[in-house]
Amino acid sequence: MSSKYPRSVRRCLPLWALTLEAALILLFYFFTHYDASLEDQKGLVASYQVGQDLTVMAAIGLGFLTSSFRRHSWSSVAFNLFMLALGVQWAILLDGFLSQFPSGKVVITLFSIRLATMSALSVLISVDAVLGKVNLAQLVVMVLVEVTALGNLRMVISNIFNTDYHMNMMHIYVFAAYFGLSVAWCLPKPLPEGTEDKDQTATIPSLSAMLGALFLWMFWPSFNSALLRSPIERKNAVFNTYYAVAVSVVTAISGSSLAHPQGKISKTYVHSAVLAGGVAVGTSCHLIPSPWLAMVLGLVAGLISVGGAKYLPGCCNRVLGIPHSSIMGYNFSLLGLLGEIIYIVLLVLDTVGAGNGMIGFQVLLSIGELSLAIVIALMSGLLTGLLLNLKIWKAPHEAKYFDDQVFWKFPHLAVGF
C-alpha cells in the first residue's frame, strides 16, 4: 500500500490550507488589535490558566481520546491539533465580527481566545464521528462550516433569547453531537471487505485514548466554569462538575462490568462514560445547590452512557457508518439532552416558586433554544456532509479508511504495519 498522499490531494491540501492561512493573517492584520488596557498581572495569569486548561482539554484530551483506532492513531491526534489551531483562529475572527465589529476593529482579549477554544472544541467533538473517513482538506471545510454555524447560533441565541455566555455555549454538547452525526450520515457508509480490522481498537492506542479521557476528566471543571461571570458561580460549577465526573467514573467502571456477561470492563465504555457527569451537569453546574444532586446526576449520566455504549453502536454503525469505538457523538447527544432537561426542570421550579404564572413561556423559550441548536446543527451538518462528498476534495477511498499510512510517512515501513 502506497504511503504517499494521492497526487491530486498533495496539490490540493497545501494550496487550500496555506491560502486559507494567508487569508486569516490578512484578516487579523486589517481587523484586529490587542486589548491595550493595563491589567493586574496576577489576574492576567489566573485568567490565562483557564484558557490553558481548555487548550489542554482540546489538544491532549480530545486529541488522544479519538486515537484508539488500531491504524489511525497518529492521524487522530495530529488532525485534531490541526483542526484546533485552525478553528481557534477562525473562531476569534468570527466572534469578533459578530459581536464587536460595528465599533471598527475586533479587540482580542484572553476571553476571546477562551471563547474561540471552546468553539473549536465543538469541531473536535463532532469529528469523532468522521475521523478516518476524511482527509485534511475535508476537515478544513468541516472546521470552517461548524465554527461559523456555532458562532451564528450563539449570536442568535444571545440576541433572541437573551442568554449569557455560559448558557449559550453549553448548547455545544448537543450541537457538536448532532452536527457530527449528520455529517457522518452523509459520508459513504459501508466498510469494504478486508478493512474491518482497521476500525478496531488496539492496546497501545486504547491506552492513549484513556490518557485523553483522563486529561478531559481532570479539566472538565475548567470547561464548565470558564464562561461564568462571578467567583461564586465558578466555584459552584467547579465543585459540582468535579462531584459529577467523580461519580460517573465509578458508575462507568462498575456499570461496564455489570453490562458484560462475564463481568469484564470495556475500554470503550470507560473512555466515554468517565466524562458523562461533566456533560450532564454542564448547563446547570453553577446552579446545583448541593453536592449530592450533582452526584446523583453523575450516576444517572454514567448509567445512560454505559447503556448507550452497549445498545447504540449497532444502530449507529448500520445507519451512520460510525465505528463502535467512536461513541462520543451519540454519548454527547444523549447526555447533552439530559443536561438541557435538568435545566428546564430547574426553570419550572424557579417559575413555580416565583408564582408569576410564566412557566409555559419560560419553558417554551428554553425548548426553543435547544430546538434551534439541534436544527442548526443538523442543517449545517448535512450541508457539510454534502460538501465533503464533492470530488474536489479527493476523499480517501473506502479501502483506505482508518489508515495512517495514507497520510503519514513511516520510513521504517515498506508496506502494511
Epitope: 482579549t109 476571553f111 467567583p231 461564586i232 458561580e233 446552579l287 430547574l346 408569576n356 413561556f361
Partner: antibody, heavy 125, light 105 residues
C-alpha cells in the same frame, strides 16, 4: 465600611482623553464584577461599561464602543475607565458600581448594590 | 430596550403607586429597580424582578417576568419622592429605563 470613590473627572476639550479611577475600600475588589454608569445633566442613568471579576471579559454600551476602555487593577483595588475621542454628549456624572450576584433556582441574578458618589466630566471647547 | 411608564407622576402621601417597565424582548426575571434622589447616587430597591434588597422597606414590591414588570409602593411616604429606574441584567450589555419621577401632588 464598603465604599467606592471615583476621581479623575474634569473639563476636557472634544477629541481629547481622560482616565477615571475608582478606589474600592471595605471589600476585596477581585471578588466582584464592576461597572461604570453615567448620568448626563437632567437626564436618566446610562450604563457605560462592565468588567468581570478577573478582568477577562469587558462589555460596553454601543455609544462608547471603540472609544472607552474599562480595566481594573485588583492588586490596587482600583477600577479604571479610559475615555478617548471625547464628545460633548459624554458630559455627565460618572459613577462606578459594584455588581452583586445572587443565585436563583434557574439562573444567577445580577445587580449593582454599591455605588460611588460620582465624578463629573465636562466635554467642552 | 427598556420602556418605563409613566415618565412622571404626582401622588400624595399614603397613595399606592405603580410604575411599569416593559422590555423589548424577554429578559426572564433579570430586572432590577433603583431609586435616585437629586444629587445622590442610585440605590437598589428590588433585584431579580421581585426580591427586596436588605434594608429596603417592605412597602416596595416588584412583580413580573419575561417582558412586563411593575414596581409598587403600597403606601407612599415623604422620603419616597424620587426618580425610579428599571434596569435589565439579562444580556451582556445592561440597559436602564428612562426613569419615572414621583412628585408630591
Amino acid at each position: 465600611q464598603v465604599k467606592l470613590l471615583e476621581s479623575g473627572g474634569g473639563v476636557v476639550q472634544p477629541g481629547r482623553s481622560l482616565r477615571l479611577s475608582c478606589i474600592a475600600s471595605g471589600f476585596t475588589l477581585r471578588n466582584y464584577a464592576m461597572h461604570w454608569v453615567r448620568q448626563a445633566p437632567g437626564k436618566g442613568l446610562e450604563w457605560v461599561a462592565g468588567i468581570w471579576f478577573d478582568g477577562s471579559n469587558k462589555n460596553y454600551a454601543d455609544s462608547v464602543k471603540g472609544r472607552f476602555t474599562i480595566s481594573r487593577d485588583n492588586s490596587k483595588n482600583t477600577l479604571f475607565l479610559h475615555m478617548n475621542s471625547l464628545r460633548a454628549e459624554d458630559t455627565a456624572t460618572y459613577y462606578c458600581a459594584r455588581e452583586r450576584a445572587i443565585r436563583g433556582i434557574s439562573r444567577y441574578n445580577y445587580y449593582m448594590d454599591v455605588w460611588g458618589k460620582g465624578t463629573t466630566v465636562t466635554v467642552s471647547s | 430596550v427598556m420602556t418605563q411608564s409613566p415618565s412622571s407622576l404626582s401622588a400624595s402621601v399614603g397613595d399606592r403607586v405603580t410604575i411599569t417597565c416593559r422590555a423589548s424582548q424577554s429578559i426572564r426575571s433579570s430586572l432590577n429597580w433603583y431609586q435616585q434622589k437629586p444629587g445622590k447616587a442610585p440605590k437598589v430597591l428590588i433585584y431579580a424582578a421581585s426580591s427586596l434588597q436588605s434594608g429596603v422597606p417592605s412597602r416596595f414590591s416588584g412583580r413580573g417576568s419575561g417582558t412586563d414588570f411593575t414596581l409598587t409602593i403600597s403606601s407612599l411616604q415623604p422620603e419616597d419622592f424620587a426618580t425610579y429606574y428599571c434596569q435589565q441584567s439579562s444580556s451582556s450589555s445592561w440597559t436602564f429605563g428612562q426613569g419615572t419621577k414621583v412628585e408630591i401632588k
